[in-house]
């Protein structure tokens, strides 16, 4: 079966939007009005992985770019990066584990847990204009809850 993808934007629970910060990094900041056009549009693909009722494996690509969020070890620490891929081969149903996130839905909020590094989550800082990162704590200072907005293809 072909991989199914939907275009969406993500905002953290403080309503910060995600934008590109250089070629291989995302940052989170509050946007208004026309500046909202700067926010990154993701192509969220429904991929193979461990699945339960509230946990769905997805890959998060940047729409019309051959970039995917991936989780790798850097200096022995799980790290979020934007990784360039061959657009002829991606997206695919069986993505490598570093590209897979468990989308967890709780109380109308979404969390994205790394499949490669359980209990590590896509996170934003309370502060404005800071990088989006992979965080190993939930419920602390850093934000791990997001909302999703559909974007037409």
């Amino acid at each position: 079966a072909p991989v199914r993808s939907l275009n969406c934007t993500l905002r953290d629970s403080q309503q910060k939007s995600l934008v590109m910060s250089g070629p291989y990094e995302l940052k989170a900041l509050h946007l208004q009005g026309q500046d909202m056009e700067q926010q990154v549009v993701f192509s969220m693909s429904f991929v193979q992985g461990e699945e339960s009722n509230d946990k769905i494996p997805v890959a998060l690509g940047l729409k019309e770019k051959n970039l995917y969020l991936s989780c790798v070890l850097k200096d022995d620490k799980p790290t979020l990066q934007l990784e360039s891929v061959d657009p002829k081969n991606y997206p695919k149903k069986k993505m490598e584990k570093r590209f897979v996130f468990n989308k967890i839905e709780i109380n109308n909020k979404l969390e994205f847990e790394s499949a490669q590094f359980p209990n590590w989550y896509i996170s934003t800082s309370q502060a404005e204009n800071m990088p989006v990162f992979l965080g190993g704590t939930k419920g602390g200072q850093d934000i791990t809850d997001f909302t999703m907005q559909f974007v037409s293809s």
């Epitope: 429904f46 193979q48 769905i56 839905e105 109308n108």
Partner: nanobody
Framework: EVQLLESGGGLVQPGGSLRLSCAAS????????MYWARQAPGKGLEWVSR????????YYADSVKGRFTISRDNSKNTLYLQMNSLRAEDTAVYYC?????????WGQGTLVTVSS
Amino acid sequence: EVQLLESGGGLVQPGGSLRLSCAASGFTFRDYVMYWARQAPGKGLEWVSRIDPMGSSTYYADSVKGRFTISRDNSKNTLYLQMNSLRAEDTAVYYCAKPEGNFDYWGQGTLVTVSS
């Protein structure tokens, strides 16, 4: 065998309303997020709306926000899409789907034509 069977499509005038239904069988409907998607003639697939298993969380494409309402009745294994203030650009084949997870299920679709 999993089945998703849409009904309720047809010809309607601009400004009119339709209610689409999708009868699900062969899987535990109440456990899954469900979607409505559509494909207009000569266009790509557009995600219209999404609803969580309990019906408490919904999403809509900007193009239908405020006009369409997704709902579900888990006791009847049925998904609904109430479409109001229909426009010519809503003309499409509408699909009921469970795209999330390792197995994605799709209905055959029901045609909605908005024309005077």
